[in-house]
Interface confidence: medium
Amino acid sequence: RGVFRRDAHKSEVAHRFKDLGEENFKALVLIAFAQYLQQCPFEDHVKLVNEVTEFAKTCVADESAENCDKSLHTLFGDKLCTVATLRETYGEMADCCAKQEPERNECFLQHKDDNPNLPRLVRPEVDVMCTAFHDNEETFLKKYLYEIARRHPYFYAPELLFFAKRYKAAFTECCQAADKAACLLPKLDELRDEGKASSAKQRLKCASLQKFGERAFKAWAVARLSQRFPKAEFAEVSKLVTDLTKVHTECCHGDLLECADDRADLAKYICENQDSISSKLKECCEKPLLEKSHCIAEVENDEMPADLPSLAADFVESKDVCKNYAEAKDVFLGMFLYEYARRHPDYSVVLLLRLAKTYETTLEKCCAAADPHECYAKVFDEFKPLVEEPQNLIKQNCELFEQLGEYKFQNALLVRYTKKVPQVSTPTLVEVSRNLGKVGSKCCKHPEAKRMPCAEDYLSVVLNQLCVLHEKTPVSDRVTKCCTESLVNRRPCFSALEVDETYVPKEFNAETFTFHADICTLSEKERQIKKQTALVELVKHKPKATKEQLKAVMDDFAAFVEKCCKADDKETCFAEEGKKLVAASQAALGL
């Protein structure tokens, strides 16, 4: 069964149960429910999942049984709407239950919360975790799925199954190791960091589909897959793009069973046709399903064919350019993007999309002109400044990163972005700037040819986090403008923002700069976040403060924390020295 051929099934739920198997079926339904009802207790979700699973089994036994012919949205929506505390817990989301499908599902989707009010996940002691794992492995792993899914309502569900498999493997191995902590903690840290990155990448895919439409996502996929599979024919890349779009549309739309099923079909297709796709797939295709799909998604770019001719011949010099464009605009532009991307693994996907947009705009104008060829003859010259802009930006920022190191580079970005958009909440500015700053350690180590795709495509993911968080509570017209005008120009839009001269500085509040002894017991990362929170607040109070002034205050602050954490009476030190620090800072900044 291909991704595109949907055989007629009497019962969709029975079909998916049989395709996916009971274990994956239950896991995916749990993820789906947790992503919709993010505040519900674990036990409630497990109960709902068990009820759905038992129902699915009756449909497997007899596809004609009552209600087995209902759509998955109807079945799942009906089940979610049985939750007794829906109105108290979710407020207006309960109104979704008064709607019919497909409006009801759309309503649930609109109420997904990217920043749910949930407590931070605290990691228990290793022995406590190992005991819980051994006592009830199934519940332990379900709890993992539940906790990740409710905090990341757009997490790519089939990929979360892969994370859960690795999570289980880590506990299986490490809970019987001599030094459990040394074995387990680095693995859990790695899963946590990879999980956050995976969630953010998927959030951009869903935003692309939901805010900018299928055409935008397909363009992104053509560019990325053409870079990855430069030996594949255009028709092959187009097939993969169409299938991949279907998979992500399903997952972003909450159709997790269909998404996981279709992703498995796509992996199967790719592996059966690897000779016409890429020489790099062999190892991936020998792995079990979840690992295989993950591996394919991360596979390195194949080598470019050696004999690729100049692009100008087909897309500038040919007398058929306007004819080909007129006959099938999207196909011709798709071919242009394919041909350009397969020749440029050194460009970011967003840059390739900017070039394709420029080419499209030029053809729109020139193919209506008196002399089309004369009009579009220099179109490739228009690409030069578009290519140089990210190249120069990356060069400058990598130099700054190498000079400052990650923490101070993050601080420089915190100041830069707080001055650009000071209305944005402090936690969001800290989170986003810290992530922007990670581009340095992630990408600056790469050679020139890999820097731009690494850096600019990563920045697109991070800026999307800012966009989705800001959309929940919009406070800045400038953020809204950069986020909504053009998906591919978000980063240049934010880069071009200068200091917001209209901003009225925040009133000074000493409480914001009052610290206590508990800071001493925090991890290095948490301590950094405290200091960076203070830095953002300083800039919001004094947006015109110079780098030097801010550096002096932050150096004093670091010395103050270090001194008081070494003191015998820490709390008294923080109280007395803190007052002095606030006064000195106010004086230094002229507050």
Partner: nanobody, 119 residues
């Protein structure tokens, strides 16, 4: 040797339908993307539709979108073009061809079948 043999053309009234077939041999049909092109009297070749080796996705020229449907039967090594709501401007010789990796052109094409739309 690659051979492509089109059939199914003929005279039809505006608004009518025709189904073209193309029998392929001499190459591995089920690993080749295929397309239909056409040439109206006194005009150049015009691209009509492409189909991937697996049967999906399919692509259409803007001028035929919603009226023409391309399909294939890999077990019979045959390509099809279902043409509905035909218009006078669809009059042309229709060719099936192998779709290559580059350009909106092709490696091989058949002898063609003439479709005339006239009242």
């Amino acid at each position: 040797e690659v051979q492509l043999l089109e059939s199914g053309g003929g005279l039809v009234q505006p608004g009518g339908s025709l189904r073209l077939s193309c029998a392929a041999s001499g190459f591995t049909f089920d690993t080749s993307s295929m397309l239909w092109v056409r040439q109206a009297p006194g005009k150049g070749l015009e691209w009509v539709s492409v189909i991937h080796q697996s049967g999906t996705p399919t692509y259409y020229a803007d001028s035929v979108k919603g009226r023409f449907t391309i399909s294939r039967d890999n077990s019979k090594n045959t390509l099809y073009l279902q043409m509905n709501s035909l218009r006078a401007e669809d009059t042309a010789v229709y060719y099936c061809a192998k779709f290559p990796s580059r350009k909106m052109k092709f490696d091989y094409r058949g002898q063609g079948t003439l479709v005339t739309v006239s009242s």
